[in-house]
Amino acid sequence: FPQDRPFEDTCHGNPSHYYDKAVRRCCYRCPMGLFPTQQCPQRPTDCRKQCEPDYYLDEADRCTACVTCSRDDLVEKTPCAWNSSRVCECRPGMFCSTSAVNSCARCFFHSVCPAGMIVKFPGTAQKNTVCEPASPGVSPACASPENCKEPSSGTIPQAKPTPVSPATSSASTMPVRGGTRLAQEAASKLTRAPDSPSSVGRPSSDPGLSPTQPCPEGSGDCRKQCEPDYYLDEAGRCTACVSCSRDDLVEKTPCAWNSSRTCECRPGMICATSATNSCARCVPYPICAAETVTKPQDMAEKDTTFEAPPLGTQPDCNPTPENGEAPASTSPTQSLLVDSQASKTLPIPTSAPVALSSTGK
C-alpha cells in the first residue's frame, strides 16, 4: 500500500530498526542473542535473553533453572515462566515445616487434633492444624465443619502425641527455658532425644493413610489401608517403613501391612548403634587378635549398642569357641527414627526412654 511507504521509509537507514508490515510500524531490532518480549519491540528494554525450557530469566538477567516439584510430597503451585521460577508447595494434607526458595524443603502431614479437642484452623500448605478445646455442649466430633463434614456413626480417629512422625506446628518460638532444637548436623549424633519441644515435632495425622470409611463404633474387624511403604502400627497409625537404602544395610524382612521393613548390616559388618527395625551405624566386622576366634553368631543381628572395647582388645572374640551362644543381648530402648534432615525436636513421652537415630524414614 503506497500510503505505508512513508512509515516504512522511516526505518530505512537505521540498522537498529525494521518495519513490521503486520503492525505497520517501525520496530526495534533486538541484538543477536536477545529476543523480543512483544511483537514489535520499541526499545532495548523490550528485548531479553531467551532461556532454555525449564529455565527463567532472573533479576540479574541470568538464565536460572526453575525448581522442580518432582518430590512426591510437592505439587506445582505456579508454572515455570520466562521471568519467574516454577513454585512448588506441599501437597494437600501436608504443610511446609522448612521453606526453601520457591519450594519447600520439608513437608509434614497435617496433625490430627488430640482426642477430645477440635479443629480451630485446618492445616494449609504453609501451616499445620491448630486445635482448641471443645466448647461446652459441643461434641468434639462435630464441633467444627472440618471435623463433621457429614454425619457418621464412628468418630474420626484422633492422634495421641507419639514420637513417630515429626511435624511442625507453625508457632515455633521457643522460650528460654530449655528450648532445645536439633541442629541438622547433630540430629544423627544424638543417642537420647530431648525431653520435649514446645511446639515442634508434632505428631502428625496418619502419613500414608488411604482415605477409608472409619470403622463403625464397636467394630473391630476393619482396618486402615496404608499407602505403599507404610505399615499400620500398634496404635493404629500409618507409619513409614524404615528404608534400607544406605549401602551398608540390607533388607532383612519386607514392609508389610502391619509391620515395618527391617534392615540389618550387610555381611561383613556389625551393628554399632542399633535403631528400631534397623541399624544407625554399621562398622566393619572386628578382626580378632591372634589365637582368638570370633563367636559363631550372626553379628548383623546383634541389636545392642556397641561400646568401644578397651584399647588392645577386640569385641566378641573368644580364645576358644566354647559354645555357640550369642552374648546376652538386652532389648534396645524404644528407638525413634528421624529423618537425618529433621531439625526439629520431637515430643517424647515421659514414661519411656527414647533413642534418637538418623536411620531410615
Epitope: G116, K127, A134, A171, P175, R177, S198, S199
Partner: antibody, heavy 121, light 107 residues
Framework: QVTLKESGPGILQPSQTLSLTCSFS??????????VSWIRQPSGKDLEWLAH???????RYNPSLKSRLTISKDTSSNQVFLKITSVDTADTATYYC?????????????WGAGTTVTVSS | DIVMTQSQKFMSTSVGDRVSVTCKAS??????VAWYQQKPGQSPEALIY???YRYSGVPDRFTGSGSGTDFTLTISNVQSEDLAEYFC?????????FGSGTKLEIK
C-alpha cells in the same frame, strides 16, 4: 527469650473497670497457632482461667465472667489487653498473662510474673 | 465446667524420695491435661502436657501419666528445689480449669 509482663492499676474501687495490659517479647502474636490467655489467682486460692485471644483475633471467654470481660490485642506493639467491668472485692487477685505457643495442645508454656490487683472501697 | 480435683492439699517428702501427686477430672478429658509447678512467690511454669509429655527443659525426674479422669504427676528422686505447689489443668473443653493445687513440703 520469651517474656510476658502484666501491668495494671494496683488498686481500684468496686464498680470500676479494671484494665490490664500484657506486654510480651520473643514471639509474635501473628504466628499461626499462637495465643495469649489471662489467668487470675486470688491469694491462697485456685487459678482461674479468664480469657484467651488467638493470633487471628478469635476470642474465648470463661462463661462465668463473659459478660464482664473483653480481651483484645495490638499485634504491632506486642500487647494483649483485658478489661473487667463492674469489679468487686472478689476480683482481688494476682492476674497473669501466659502464652499458648503450641497449635495442638492448649498448655501455657510461659507465664508473666503477675500483677496484683486489689479492689477496695 | 470440668472440675479438676487434687485431693491432697499438702504432701510431705524427703530429698531422694519418690512422690506422686494425683488429679481427678469430673468427666473424661482424654489426655488433655497439663501440669504446672509454682514455686513460692513465683508464677507457674509448665512441666507436663498431654498428660505424659515433658515440656522442654524439665528434668526427667518429672513424669506424667493417666488418661480419661485420673492423672498422676510423679517426682522421682525429689530435690530441695522441687519445693513448690503443683497444679493440674485440663484443656479438653472450655473453660480451661485448674486443680486446687498440691503443696510439696520437703522434710
Amino acid at each position: 527469650q520469651v517474656t510476658l509482663k502484666e501491668s495494671g492499676p494496683g488498686i481500684l474501687q468496686p464498680s470500676q473497670t479494671l484494665s490490664l495490659t500484657c506486654s510480651f517479647s520473643g514471639f509474635s502474636l501473628s504466628t499461626s497457632g499462637m495465643g495469649v490467655s489471662w489467668i487470675r489467682q486470688p491469694s491462697g486460692k485456685d487459678l482461674e482461667w479468664l480469657a484467651h485471644i488467638y493470633w487471628d483475633d478469635d476470642k474465648r471467654y470463661n462463661p462465668s465472667l463473659k459478660s464482664r470481660l473483653t480481651i483484645s490485642k495490638d499485634t504491632s506493639s506486642n500487647q494483649v489487653f483485658l478489661k473487667i467491668t463492674s469489679v468487686d472485692t472478689a476480683d482481688t487477685a494476682t492476674y497473669y498473662c501466659a502464652r499458648r505457643a503450641d497449635g495442638l495442645y492448649f498448655y501455657l508454656d510461659v507465664w508473666g510474673a503477675g500483677t496484683t490487683v486489689t479492689v477496695s472501697s | 465446667d470440668i472440675v479438676m480435683t487434687q485431693s491432697q492439699k499438702f504432701m510431705s517428702t524427703s530429698v531422694g524420695d519418690r512422690v506422686s501427686v494425683t488429679c481427678k477430672a469430673s468427666q473424661n478429658v482424654n489426655t488433655n491435661v497439663a501440669w504446672y509447678q509454682q514455686k513460692p512467690g513465683q508464677s507457674p511454669e509448665a512441666l507436663i502436657y498431654s498428660a505424659s509429655y515433658r515440656y522442654s527443659g524439665v528434668p526427667d525426674r518429672f513424669t506424667g501419666s493417666g488418661s480419661g479422669t485420673d492423672f498422676t504427676l510423679t517426682i522421682s528422686n525429689v530435690q530441695s528445689e522441687d519445693l513448690a505447689e503443683y497444679f493440674c489443668q485440663q484443656y479438653n473443653s472450655y473453660p480451661l480449669t485448674f486443680g486446687s493445687g498440691t503443696k510439696l513440703e520437703i522434710k
